[in-house]
């Protein structure tokens, strides 16, 4: 069927359009184009005879039309009146005619639009603004953009006049934005320049900063006022109702108690004609006195005396605070505060209560601290310690013992041998000792202030013969590959050599073995199960030697990966399944079995009589050692074949 396609269908003024003919019949004589929906000689545009290739203009020819041999018609420099229908009349050789009609539409190229407004300075919550997109254009669509986004849904926004007018009712400061309009038709789209809406608002209630309302005499008062407003607000300050100045900031240096009162900031917007005020009450306080601490006992005795610390001076309606060691008071049943917090009582003082202590007087502005006070707690003496720690000495050496006891004031020392007073010194020195110097050596420490005494007795043996040593250990059950163990050979003896044996052999060379403390301490790093041996220490000097009893190290290890035996995995139906699981572990591991993931029993041996193919599956043995905190497992697949179908094993 003969058809006509307009390319394009919508044509811009000044452009061109091609009326393209489809399905043109064979054996043509010629054809003619007409303006309109039918053949009308008065509206012929052009005719064309194929034989002569001759084109003949008609009454409707404008000089802008070109006809092509394939009957297509090109119209150039399109004008608005070209809009409409076009009919092609085809004359065939057999003089049978065919007709087809096509059409196109002509639209103007749109100009760049602009926005007009009915109110350039609307007032917030009062005015409405109507934006209109200019010019008014036929067959154009109007769109609006706010801050380059399409219009938000809002009951305060209304489109009218074919969307050409955008009205904002009851404008707010948030409507201050960039507005654009856009015109569109089928052949063009143009966007306007942006228009910024200038909404007049405020002033809001002003805020006065800083927020603090309490000041100390002698400080500077610097208040600043701010109110949201467009255009920016004009500010005025009033003190106790009296106008002061028209500035945003109020500055009063070196204030006194007389500057206390109500401070008002007034904000004014000349365009909206509105005023808003905010009042703050400023209180100026006189400088309080610096506090100090008095004590009812300057030299309290530990575990006997109580001490009452009082914060001076006494001021009515004042909050008193306390600090110990620059921290707030700890919770302790030995610390008591009076009802007004002015007196802090330390019940049964200890040497750790020395302080420093500070008290503070709090007013509305700040806290004034006293100077720190330190308590002189009398304590001790504690049990004296005698050094060195040796108890065995060889004849002929010098004996030099030193005594120390924690005490305040420092202790006075006395030495006694076998109950007989020797001297009143901290150190006792005896040269060239003999067996006769063996005995009980007592150090007595005395605190003259508290009147307390404490003693420590040490047995000194002067002998060529050494005692039988013993081994002490810092870890009786170390975990393999994790713990270290330190063995120490006791006692500590002067001028003595310490030796070690493992399983009756001298120490092997190993980076995991370390001797220290004059060989008196043997450390095994990262113990292994192979370290579970018999350890012996020995002591010797030039005249004697002695060995300890052996100490066996109990190393916790495992569980290692278990082994399931027998290793067979194929069984005949009717056989007995007897699986045994073993894992090296100390202590012995806890065993448990799972068949196809289902928990079974907690035994080392799993026995199933007369198995069938239903017993096929995975058999898992789990081992656990709570002492090492470690677990392990192994899985074995068991296949049971019906009797006679498999060369598998029978258990």
């Amino acid at each position: 069927k003969l058809t006509i396609e307009s390319t394009p269908f919508n044509v811009a003024e000044g452009k061109e359009v091609l009326l393209l003919v489809h399905n043109l019949p064979q054996h043509l004589f010629g054809y003619s184009w007409y303006k309109g929906e039918r053949v009308d000689g008065n509206r012929q545009i052009i005719g064309y005879v194929i034989g002569t290739q001759q084109a003949t203009p008609g009454p409707a020819y404008s000089g802008r039309e070109i006809i092509y041999p394939n009957a297509s018609l090109l119209i150039q420099n399109i004008i608005q009146n070209d809009t409409g229908f076009y009919t092609l009349h085809v004359i065939k050789s057999d003089l049978v005619n065919e007709e087809a009609t096509g059409q196109f539409r002509v639209y103007p190229e749109l100009p760049k639009p602009s926005i007009s407004s009915n109110n350039s300075k609307p007032v917030e919550d009062k005015d409405a603004v109507a934006f209109t997109c200019e010019p008014e254009t036929q067959d154009a669509t109007y769109l609006w953009w706010v801050n380059n986004q399409s219009l938000p849904v809002s009951p305060r926004l209304q489109l009218s006049n074919g969307n050409r007018t955008l009205t904002l009712f009851n404008v707010t400061r948030n409507d201050t934005a960039s507005y654009k309009c856009e015109t569109q038709n089928p052949v063009s789209a143009r966007r306007s320049d942006s228009v910024i809406l200038n909404v007049l608002y405020g002033p809001d209630a002003p805020t006065i900063s800083p927020l603090n309302t309490s000041y100390r005499s002698g400080e500077n008062l610097n208040l600043s006022c701010h109110a949201a407003s467009n255009p920016p607000a004009q500010y005025s300050w009033f003190v106790n109702g009296t106008f002061q100045q028209s500035t945003q900031e109020l500055f009063i240096p070196n204030i006194t108690v007389n500057n206390s009162g109500s401070y008002t900031c007034q904000a004014h917007n000349s365009d909206t004609g509105l005023n808003r005020t905010t009042v703050t009450t400023i209180t100026v306080y006189a400088e309080p006195p610096k506090p100090f601490i008095t004590s009812n006992n300057s030299n309290p005795v530990e575990d006997e005396d109580a001490v009452a610390l009082t914060c001076e001076p006494e001021i009515q309606n004042t909050t008193y605070l306390w600090w110990v060691n620059n921290q707030s008071l700890p919770v302790s049943p030995r610390l008591q505060l009076s009802n007004d917090n002015r007196t802090l009582t330390l019940l049964s003082v200890t040497r750790n209560d020395v302080g420093p202590y500070e008290c503070g007087i709090q007013n509305e502005l700040s806290v004034d601290h006293s100077d720190p006070v330190i308590l002189n707690v009398l304590y001790g003496p504690d049990d004296p310690t005698i050094s060195p720690s040796y108890t065995y000495y060889r004849p002929g050496v010098n004996l030099s013992l030193s005594c120390h006891a924690a005490s305040n004031p420092p202790a006075q020392y006395s030495w006694l041998i076998d109950g007989n007073i020797q001297q009143h010194t901290q150190e006792l020195f005896i040269s060239n000792i003999t067996e006769k110097n063996s005995g009980l050596y007592t150090c007595q420490a005395n605190n003259s202030a508290s009147g307390h005494s404490r003693t420590t007795v040490k047995t000194i043996t002067v002998s060529a013969e050494l005692p039988k040593p013993s081994i002490s250990s810092n870890n009786s059950k170390p975990v393999e590959d994790k713990d270290a163990v330190a063995f120490t050979c006791e006692p500590e003896a002067q001028n003595t050599t310490y030796l070690w044996w493992v399983n009756g052999q001298s120490l092997p060379v190993s980076p995991r073995l370390q001797l220290s403390n004059g060989n008196r301490t043997l450390t095994l790093f990262n113990v292994t199960r192979n370290d579970a041996r018999a350890y012996v220490c020995g002591i010797q000097n030039s005249v004697s030697a002695n060995r300890s009893d052996p100490v066996t190290l109990d190393v916790l290890y495992g569980p290692d990966t278990p082994i399931i035996s027998p290793p067979d995995s194929s069984y005949l139906s009717g056989a007995n399944l007897n699986l045994s699981c073993h894992s090296a572990s100390n202590p012995s591991p806890q065993y448990s079995w799972r068949i196809n993931g289902i928990p079974q029993q907690h035994t080392q041996v799993l026995f199933i009589a007369k198995i069938t193919p239903n017993n096929n599956g995975t058999y898992a043995c789990f081992v656990s050692n709570l002492a090492t905190g470690r677990n392990n497992s192994i899985v074995k697949s068991i296949t049971v074949s019906a009797s006679g179908t498999s060369p598998g094993l029978s258990a």
Epitope: K477, S588, L626
Partner: antibody, heavy 120, light 107 residues
């Protein structure tokens, strides 16, 4: 189901011996170790020792060493606990109990108890 | 031998109360600790092993915790049927030893 059935109550004179039996059923007898625990009237529980029915290995509390003997008969799935040189303070209920597994497990099934009274 | 010390020796609580019994070992037993319940005239019943593993069939109101030397049995909401004596026992090698027991009664 697992059951441990003990022999009946016994009255013995001081210096005599007593042999209490414990018959196991409902599980594989040789797979689980059996322990003996006693409880004097109004008192707590006291562990006596255990036997591995598979190997016959025994381990006794130091307190009962030399006076206690534990044996087993695998053909009847029965364990026995014999206590000799009885004294009045041996008056107690004697329980056999199965260990929940092997090595370092607690006791999950207990016999009904056998009251042994030692009195002159 | 490892000594086991239980506390308290007895307690009385109301139905619905949370009850806690503690057990202390004289040396490190890691997690090898069991709890038993013995009702008057009955045989002991295993509740918990490995310090915190609940035996199948034991109500979930029973729970155990602890490791090393200090252990706890908790009954979250005491019921009338929980009246019994509770024993702890270490199962870290022989000899096994029991605590002296804690008698739980209803107020």
């Amino acid at each position: 189901q697992v059951q441990l059935v003990q022999s009946g109550a016994e009255v013995k004179k001081p210096g005599a011996s007593v042999k209490v039996s414990c018959k196991a059923s409902g599980y594989i007898f040789t797979s689980y170790w059996l322990h003996w625990v006693r409880q004097a009237p109004g008192q707590g529980l006291e562990w006596i020792g255990y036997i591995n029915p598979n190997t016959g290995y025994t381990s006794y509390s130091q307190k009962f060493q030399g006076r206690v003997t534990m044996t087993r008969d695998t053909s009847t799935s029965t364990v026995y606990m014999e206590l000799s040189s009885l004294r009045s303070e041996d008056t107690a209920v004697y329980y056999c109990a199965r260990e929940y597994g092997n090595y370092n497990y607690p006791l999950d099934y207990w016999g009904q108890g056998t009251l042994v009274t030692v009195s002159s | 031998d490892i000594q086991m010390t239980q506390s308290p020796s007895s307690l009385s609580a109301s139905v619905g109360d949370r009850v806690t019994i503690t057990c202390r070992a004289s040396e490190n037993i890691y997690g090898y600790l069991a709890w038993y319940q013995q009702k008057p005239g009955k045989v002991p019943k295993l509740l918990i092993y490995n310090a915190k593993n609940l035996v199948e069939g034991v109500p979930s109101r029973f729970s155990g915790s602890g490791s090393g030397t200090d252990f706890t049995l908790t009954i979250s909401s005491l019921q009338p049927e929980d009246v019994a004596t509770y024993y702890c026992q270490h199962h870290y090698g022989t000899p096994y030893t029991f605590g002296q027991g804690t008698k739980v009664e209803i107020k």
